[in-house]
Interface confidence: medium
């Protein structure tokens, strides 16, 4: 591993038992105090996106070899670090492989690909919610509920770059019934497949389903933003959508370049570079503070492309909520 840290035994390189390298030797990390902030830093270091869990390292096969050492007793990250090596660490004094730390990241490698041609979610609000349709021999087909599972929904959401599946096993409302041929039923996905077409299924077009059994899937909302509290859509307190929840953005490091990206993304012209006082007239937000230390070059098309701390990690209050005023 180029970085001296790796995840071993997972379904992909972004999950598994945590192993670090010291003096040419790979060893494990004890899970004393191991939490989501430590995983967030590790995921960032590995280029694996956001942290999604802190599973036990013993879940991953093959287990650590007996002669392999536990190299670190505890790691304590604040979440601001770029690498595990920057986090406070304690030398081993009492730990066995039963306590090996594990980590699970969102693995962005599968979610940055362009929207594939072979599957879509139709008639929904945006491309991440809707009726499942699959393309076969240049024809779009619906998918029957029979045999459909959360694992299949996970595959679709991942294939579309839409994050996690948040709703499945839902039949379409009448207005969203398909009018296409019904493709197949008895989908049997493991959840690990790269595409829905890789899942075993019943034969093409041979089923007894009706369109009232068409499958509807909703994936985690993609990134979105809005300006609230202003006179129009191009001015106000900035809010971003993450995991289906709107939250504010902290003004640490916020400046002209960040303003410009927001205005550009909203199609609101250029930033009017408001004064500190003008920015504060929209008042503080409530609820989640999603982003802190946002850093843009100004070239980005979306705020999502700018650097920032791990989602939800901040040292701010709502008094520091960002507001943006664009030319419209």
């Amino acid at each position: 591993s180029p970085s001296g840290v790796r995840l071993v035994g997972g379904l992909h390189r972004c999950e598994g038992r945590v192993e670090v390298e010291q003096k040419g030797q790979w060893g494990t990390v004890c899970d004393d105090g191991w939490d989501i902030k430590d995983v967030a830093v590790l995921c960032r270091e590995l280029g694996c996106g956001a942290a999604s869990g802190t599973p036990s390292g013993i879940l991953y096969e093959p287990p650590a070899e007996k002669e392999q050492k536990v190299l670190i007793q505890s790691v304590s990250c604040t979440g601001t670090e770029d690498t595990l090596a920057q986090c406070e660490q304690e030398e081993v004094y009492d730990c066995s492989h039963d306590e090996d730390a594990g980590a699970s990241c969102e693995n962005p490698e599968s979610s940055f690909s362009p929207v594939p041609e072979g599957v879509r979610l139709a008639d929904g609000p945006g491309h991440c919610k809707g009726r499942v349709e699959v393309k076969h021999q240049n024809q779009w087909y619906t998918v029957c509920q029979t045999g459909w599972s959360l694992r299949a929904a996970k595959v679709v959401c991942r294939q579309l770059g839409c994050g996690r599946a948040v709703l499945t096993q839902k039949r379409c409302n009448k207005h969203a019934y398909g009018r296409k041929p019904i493709w197949l039923s008895q989908m049997s996905c493991s959840g690990r497949e790269a595409t829905l077409q890789d899942c075993p299924s019943g034969p093409w077009g041979k089923n007894t389903c009706n369109h009232d059994e068409d499958t509807w899937v909703e994936c985690e909302d993609p990134f979105d933003l809005r300006l609230v509290g202003g006179d129009n859509l191009c001015s106000g307190r900035l809010e971003v959508l993450h995991k289906g929840v709107w939250g504010s953005v902290c003004d640490d490091n916020w400046g002209e370049k960040e303003d410009q990206v927001v205005c550009k993304q909203l199609g609101c012209g250029k930033s009017l570079s408001p004064s500190f006082r003008d920015r504060k007239c929209y008042g503080p937000g409530v609820g989640r503070i999603w982003l802190d230390n946002v850093r843009c070059s100004g070239e980005e098309q979306s705020l999502e492309q700018c650097q920032h701390r791990f989602w939800g990690f901040h040292d701010c209050t709502h008094q520091e909520d960002v507001a943006v005023i664009c030319s419209g």
Epitope: S3, G4, Q22, I72, T80, E81, A85, Q89, N253
Partner: antibody
Framework: QSVEESGGRLVTPGTPLTLTCTVS????????MNWVRQAPGKGLEWIGL?????TTHYASWVNGRFTISKTSTTVTLKMTSLTAADTATYFC??????????WGQGTLVTISS | ELVLTQTPASVSEPVGGTVTIKCQAS??????LVWYQQKPGQPPKLLIY???NLESGVPSRFKGSGSGTEYTLTISGVQCADAATYYC?????????FGGGTEVEIK
């Protein structure tokens, strides 16, 4: 966001000296902070750091002569048993990179009899 | 104790040329290696973090690479403004270490 060092001055060998690093725009409960020094015409030399938790670690050459501590908005470096070899510009720096690397302008410490 | 050996100690290159600075660690390190540029009378300025990530606002002619014990900073198409001293620095277990520095002169 900024860091600013103060307290550097001319002192005689053996005189203790305390340098202060004042931070603004971010919280010391989220970042580790480093002290680094640079003798005239020489390279950068790491002195030590204080983690968000308050735990401190030092370069092996420090040998207990320096102590780092912090309050909610300041990080201090207490120096004892100073000699001419400790003459340098002392920098305070935040230990994070992707969130914006921050260094102060430095404060000059001169040890001379 | 971890030691970072930086080579060469100094280099002179004409405008438009390429400068390569190497940083070798005495043992395998995390990619928590960063590169700084320092000009006289100023604090160091971050160029590269995580061995290869370009800091925001830094020109793309600066490139960091490497893994394990060997790391490199390459400046392609050097300009007069690049005359400075460059340092590598890494984070180890509860410690931070600097390389000795490389002085870059532009002819």
């Amino acid at each position: 966001q900024s860091v600013e060092e103060s307290g550097g001055r001319l002192v005689t060998p053996g005189t203790p000296l305390t340098l202060t690093c004042t931070v603004s725009g971010f919280s010391l409960s989220s970042y580790a902070m480093n002290w680094v020094r640079q003798a005239p015409g020489k390279g950068l030399e790491w002195i030590g750091l204080i983690y968000a938790s308050g735990t401190t670690h030092y370069a092996s050459w420090v040998n207990g002569r320096f102590t780092i501590s912090k309050t909610s908005t300041t990080v201090t470096l207490k120096m004892t048993s100073l000699t001419a070899a400790d003459t340098a510009t002392y920098f305070c720096a935040r230990d994070s990179y992707s969130t914006g690397n921050l260094w102060g302008q430095g404060t000059l410490v001169t040890i001379s009899s | 104790e971890l030691v970072l050996t930086q080579t060469p100690a100094s280099v002179s290159e004409p405008v438009g040329g390429t400068v390569t600075i190497k940083c070798q660690a005495s043992q395998s390190i995390y990619s928590s290696l960063v590169w700084y540029q320092q000009k006289p009378g100023q604090p160091p300025k971050l160029l590269i973090y995580g061995a290869s990530n370009l800091e925001s606002g830094v020109p793309s002619r600066f490139k960091g690479s490497g893994s394990g014990t060997e790391y490199t900073l390459t400046i392609s198409g050097v300009q007069c403004a690049d005359a400075a001293t460059y340092y590598c620095q890494c984070s180890g277990y509860n410690s931070r270490v600097f390389g000795g520095g490389t002085e870059v002169e532009i002819k």
